[in-house]
Interface confidence: medium
């Protein structure tokens, strides 16, 4: 349904508040280095223009596409060349190439200062003085640091952020009320950003078909009572929403997401029995709730799949007539029966089935050829089951911090060329799988663990893509989306790696470590551990443990000393010498 003015259409659909917030997010995700005030000015100009189009859709420029309008606005930034370098060349292009150019310059690891949380009283004063600016600043700071954050979901986070300040700034103990809420929002926000980053990578690097396959599997697990046609409709709509958001079309994305939530709630009887509570909530909460809703119960007495997908004489005929529909039905039928499998495992099974049909439907006796296809599934199912069992046992034995350290050593030996901050960040996140998933009963462990690992390994892939240093990482990241985790799991120690030169400065510590939070102190120690492995990749677990224990004792001793700085200087030299001796450096 074509509209005379797209900008007027979206302004009317979304309302002024959401329109302004989404334009701010879009601009901050594109121009990540621009000051807040510059973005606010651009947003206000766009909003005023949109209002003129609402008043008269035939007014000058109102018929232009949103990409044209927003791109033109971004290209008015005076400091574009100085701040962004070659990104300024995007402005010489025409749409749609200009928008593609902006997208390619999004930076997953922008050089921005860490967000430091001010004192609670300072934050509450700022909130009361100018609530609107305070919330806009939150959107801006999150969006520029997470250029693929799911925009309509960021509006939901902002709503919760506002609610936290509204409640807690009136509380007797503001800090006790506010800080846990902000910690929760920060952790959930990081997780949400990483999950969305995988969706965008799936669409951008592997195409719409890969994303749709993921969506069929996940929605079939979540809505096992829904018919295949219903699931297919939801998949098509969801793909459109995420394609738009990943492509920077945030107004369309938010609008379409609202329409999808409306459709799901109007048709919940034919989708899932678990949607009732979600559908009673306001829009932002409703969409979030639907996205997180628990799996519905599987229908009773589902027939075996063998009849339709192996025993039937029409398998090759049905496959040839509509390959993707037939494979989609296979994935749907398999996924709805297996909420206990990870989505990536289901996709591996579907890929194996597809490969078998491609081969067998061209054979002399197709049925004889594919009759044993499901025997090929057994090892694919058992591999993640065994891996999760082993790693959960290790996690329960070591606890989170030491489990992270074991993974740090494992991954540094696999891909020692990767930067130390990236190895620390990724391994810490990989290690969180233990506390996140090992507490679950076995039926929920695999979907929790393997699908979470897919999200974390995607972080490694997008950070590595910015500055590629390892052919092994590139290979695991680009060959197959669903086999990334098995690919990394299969990597052994990189025998071609030339150990890093020893640099005492890397292992020199100062009294400032004593004032760090427990988390920051862990990161310092884990950074040292990665550097140790890079210097001595053949070091045994026992050697590394001994050095790390000595290091922990050294930090504890010097933090208790009267003259901390002298202690760090003198004891630090001894520690470096002892470590070199222990590791044969």
């Amino acid at each position: 349904d074509a509209h005379k003015s797209e900008v007027a259409h979206r302004f009317k659909d979304l309302g002024e508040e959401n329109f302004k917030a989404l334009v701010l997010i879009a601009f901050a995700q594109y121009l990540q280095q621009c000051p807040f005030e510059d973005h606010v000015k651009l947003v206000n100009e766009v909003t005023e223009f949109a209002k003129t189009c609402v008043a008269d859709e035939s007014a000058e420029n109102c018929d232009k596409s949103l990409h044209t309008l927003f791109g033109d606005k971004l290209c008015t930034v005076a400091t574009l060349r100085e701040t962004y370098g070659e990104m300024a060349d995007c402005c010489a292009k025409q749409e749609p190439e200009r928008n593609e150019c902006f997208l390619q310059h999004k930076d997953d690891n922008p050089n921005l200062p860490r967000l430091v949380r001010p004192e609670v009283d300072v934050m509450c004063t700022a909130f009361h003085d100018n609530e609107e600016t305070f919330l806009k600043k939150y959107l801006y700071e999150i969006a520029r640091r997470h250029p693929y954050f799911y925009a309509p979901e960021l509006l939901f986070f902002a709503k919760r952020y506002k609610a936290a300040f509204t409640e807690c700034c009136q509380a007797a103990d503001k800090a006790a009320c506010l800080l846990p809420k902000l910690d929760e929002l920060r952790d959930e926000g990081k997780a949400s950003s990483a999950k969305q980053r995988l969706k965008c990578a799936s669409l951008q690097k592997f195409g719409e078909r890969a994303f749709k396959a993921w969506a069929v599997a996940r929605l079939s697990q979540r809505f096992p009572k829904a018919e295949f046609a219903e699931v297919s409709k939801l998949v098509t709509d969801l793909t459109k929403v995420h394609t738009e958001c990943c492509h920077g079309d945030l107004l369309e994305c938010a609008d379409d997401r609202a329409d999808l939530a409306k459709y799901i709630c109007e048709n919940q009887d034919s989708i899932s029995s678990k949607l009732k509570e979600c559908c009673e909530k306001p829009l932002l909460e409703k969409s979030h709730c639907i996205a997180e809703v628990e799996n519905d119960e599987m229908p009773a007495d589902l027939p075996s799949l063998a009849a339709d997908f192996v025993e039937s004489k029409d398998v090759c005929k049905n496959y040839a007539e509509a390959k993707d529909v037939f494979l989609g039905m296979f994935l749907y039928e398999y996924a709805r029966r297996h909420p206990d499998y990870s989505v990536v495992l289901l996709l591996r099974l579907a890929k194996t089935y597809e490969t078998t049909l491609e081969k067998c439907c061209a054979a002399a006796d197709p049925h004889e050829c594919y009759a044993k296809v499901f025997d090929e599934f057994k090892p694919l199912v058992e591999e993640p089951q065994n891996l999760i069992k082993q790693n959960c046992e290790l996690f329960e034995q070591l606890g989170e911090y030491k489990f992270q350290n074991a993974l740090l050593v494992r991954y540094t030996k696999k891909v020692p060329q990767v930067s130390t901050p990236t190895l620390v960040e990724v391994s810490r996140n990989l290690g969180k799988v233990g506390s996140k998933c090992c507490k679950h009963p076995e039926a929920k462990r695999m979907p929790c663990a393997e699908d979470y690992l897919s999200v974390v390994l995607n972080q490694l892939c997008v950070l590595h893509e910015k500055t590629p240093v390892s052919d092994r990482v590139t290979k695991c990241c680009t060959e197959s989306l669903v086999n990334r985790r098995p690919c990394f799991s299969a990597l052994e120690v990189d025998e071609t790696y030339v150990p890093k030169e020893f640099n005492a400065e890397t292992f020199t510590f100062h009294a400032d470590i004593c004032t760090l939070s427990e988390k920051e102190r862990q990161i310092k120690k884990q950074t040292a551990l990665v550097e140790l492995v890079k210097h001595k990749p053949k070091a045994t677990k026992e050697q590394l443990k001994a050095v790390m224990d000595d290091f922990a004792a050294f930090v504890e001793k010097c933090c208790k000393a009267d003259d901390k700085e002298t202690c760090f200087a003198e004891e630090g030299k001894k520690l470096v010498a002892a470590s070199q001796a222990a590791l044969g450096l």
Partner: nanobody, 116 residues
Framework: QVQLVESGGGLVQPGGSLRLSCAAS????????LAWYRQAPGKQRDLVAR???????HYADSVKGRFTVSRDNAENTLVLQMNSLKPEDTAVYYC??????????WGQGTQVTVSS
């Protein structure tokens, strides 16, 4: 295929307890739902309780609050803990496995008799 063997049946007094076990072997990796059914003499076979691969459970109204179904995927076993047994619980209890790939499988059955 999946093979099932039940154990734990026997004679018990009203108000007593029994624990039925079902050991699965063969292509257990393909099982999604496990269930207990029962058949009293001259009656049809009825669902008692089932548990899906996602861990969700369903009970017949007549046993709710008295029977508990659980599964151990690592050991490939299904358990039915039966408390506060009544004479009307007397039946042959069958283990049932619904598999993704194979036709449904049934055990041979184990007799439970509740009588004073």
């Amino acid at each position: 295929q999946v093979q099932l063997v039940e154990s734990g049946g026997g004679l018990v007094q009203p108000g007593g307890s029994l624990r039925l076990s079902c050991a699965a072997s063969g292509s257990t990796w393909s099982i999604n739902t496990l269930a207990w059914y029962r058949q009293a003499p001259g009656k049809q076979r009825d669902l008692v309780a089932r548990i899906s691969s996602g861990g969700s459970t369903h009970y017949a109204d007549s046993v709710k609050g008295r029977f508990t179904v659980s599964r151990d995927n690592a050991e490939n076993t299904l358990v039915l803990q039966m408390n506060s047994l009544k004479p009307e619980d007397t039946a042959v209890y069958y283990c049932y496995a619904q598999s993704t790939w194979y036709p449904p499988s049934w055990g041979q059955g184990t007799q439970v008799t509740v009588s004073s």
